[in-house]
Interface confidence: low
């Protein structure tokens, strides 16, 4: 980009340096070079000379016109051909930007990950604006009516210690950039209703040799929440379809879940939990692989998981909470 250049003239953009993508724009260049009546004025975009749509307005000024400008950023500069000068002389340069005003932020959501000490608020920003867009998160206590504001470029972590106005709040988001400003609807939250339990982790698996061999999955969470509902999903690594089991869980001890699986097949497991009856789920836990033996008992522990990675595996998924893309968290 153009930051600090020594200008011998002026360059400007109509309607503005930052404008709505797809607009027609005009870039004007006016030379002010000592002892130079320019023979010709040239425009460059990102270092490449423009050949078309240049109009000479008067002795010192020219205009470059673009129809339907779609580039998010461009560095423009112009030069003059001066008599008795071997090289073109730089007049000036300018960075231009095109983009969109922000959409109304929607789907504002706030969650507290257990032990994080923060309330994480996120929203759907809408379509890409291409230009610098800031967000102001407003948090207003419904008990004290005190309002706090937080400036951010994306999501925000708000320390729960700073939420001194009781348990009930209104949260809304304002989005603003050079092309406009929008405000979301207000979200009403109760701090006790938005806690996501500490992550559930699968620690090991073992297959017990019996008349019908069974696999036991050991899993745990550090949560202090008493009533927790969990889901475990599993599938053969060669399959696309997951099986889902549901559990009502008390994490005072390590959980043991039994599965009757096919022998000599590599399986993948994941688990996630939520506070029973509440809205938000944990992200799915990291992939845990276990290969069932042909006949001999086998134990797979977390420490050896890197050895069991199958680089050819495609973990395709659903974000119903029953399959998720790229193992991303599904909080809905």
């Amino acid at each position: 980009g153009i930051t600090n250049i020594n200008c011998s003239g002026h360059i400007w953009v109509e309607p503005a340096t930052i404008f709505k993508m797809g607009m027609n724009i005009s870039i004007y260049c006016q030379a002010a070079i000592k002892n130079c009546q320019p023979r010709k004025l040239h425009f460059y975009k990102n270092g490449i000379k423009e050949r078309f749509q240049i109009t000479r307005i008067n002795k010192t000024t020219a205009r470059l016109w673009y129809k339907n400008f779609l580039e998010p950023h461009a560095s423009m500069y112009c030069t003059a051909e001066c008599p008795k000068h071997f090289q073109e002389t730089l007049i000036c340069g300018k960075d231009i930007s095109s983009g969109y005003p922000p959409d109304i932020p929607d789907e504002v959501t706030c969650v507290i990950y257990e032990y994080s000490g923060n309330m994480t608020c996120t929203w759907n920003a809408g379509k890409l604006t291409y230009i610098d867009t800031k967000y102001v998160v407003h948090v207003k206590s419904l008990e004290t009516e005190e309002e706090q504001q937080y400036l951010t470029s994306s999501y925000i972590n708000i320390s729960t210690d700073s939420l001194q106005g009781g348990k009930k709040y209104l949260v809304w988001v304002q989005a603003a950039n050079a092309l406009g400003m929008e405000e979301s609807k207000q979200l009403q939250i109760h701090l006790d209703d938005i806690v996501i339990p500490s992550a559930a982790v699968i620690s090991r698996a073992e297959t017990i040799n019996a008349t019908v061999p069974k696999t036991i999955i050991y899993w745990d969470s550090q949560t202090t929440i008493e009533k927790v509902s969990c889901e475990m999903r599993y599938k053969a690594t060669t399959n696309q379809t997951w099986n889902v089991k549901e559990f009502d869980t008390n994490f005072t001890y390590v959980q043991q879940s039994e599965f009757y699986l096919e022998p000599n097949i590599k399986y993948v497991f994941q688990v996630r939990c939520q506070e029973t009856g509440k809205r938000y789920w944990q992200p799915w836990s990291s992939l845990f692989f276990h290969k069932t033996p042909e006949t001999v008992p086998q134990v797979t522990s977390k420490a050896f998981q890197h050895d069991t990675w199958n680089s050819g595996l495609t973990v395709a998924s659903i974000s119903t909470g029953h399959l998720t893309s790229d193992n991303r968290g599904d909080i809905g």
Epitope: D103, D106, E107, T109, V111, T120, T122, W123, N124, A125, G126, K127, S154, Y155, Q240, T241, R279, P283, A316, S317, I318, S319, T320, G321, H322, L323, T324, S325, R328, G329, D330, I331, G332
Partner: nanobody, 121 residues
């Protein structure tokens, strides 16, 4: 805001079939997958099946091999084909949008109003 409308419920004899539909309308910037849940009288709502936008499916053990989930993207509709129905399949069936989430984009889920399925022996 997304609206969901279920249809296709009804009464059927054990061993019979029904096809439920879940039609989604309303525009959102979030990408959603669709899940079916059911709730028997006096019981909690339970997951039945789900389908992602790329067609990958998920089923509860209790319906695997009997139920098939599918989608028609052109019609914004997801179907649940229920075969070999059992009396224990009797419940109100709900569809739900499930958002694909990242830390910078958590989207709201939406529920439909439900459609009743009754299986008699």
């Amino acid at each position: 805001q997304v609206q969901l409308q279920e249809s296709g419920g009804g009464s059927v004899q054990a061993g019979g079939s029904l096809r439920l539909s879940c039609a989604a309308s309303g525009y959102t910037y979030c990408n959603y997958d669709i899940a079916w849940y059911r709730q028997a009288p006096g019981k909690e709502r339970k997951f039945v099946s789900a389908i992602a936008s790329d067609g990958i499916t998920s089923y509860a053990d209790s319906v695997k091999g009997r139920f098939t989930i599918s989608q028609d993207n052109a019609k914004n509709t997801v179907y649940l084909q229920m075969n070999s129905l059992k009396p224990e399949d009797t419940a109100m069936y709900y569809c739900k949008t499930d958002p694909i989430s990242t830390i910078t984009r958590i989207c709201d889920p939406y529920w439909g109003q439900g459609t009743q399925v009754t299986v008699s022996s």
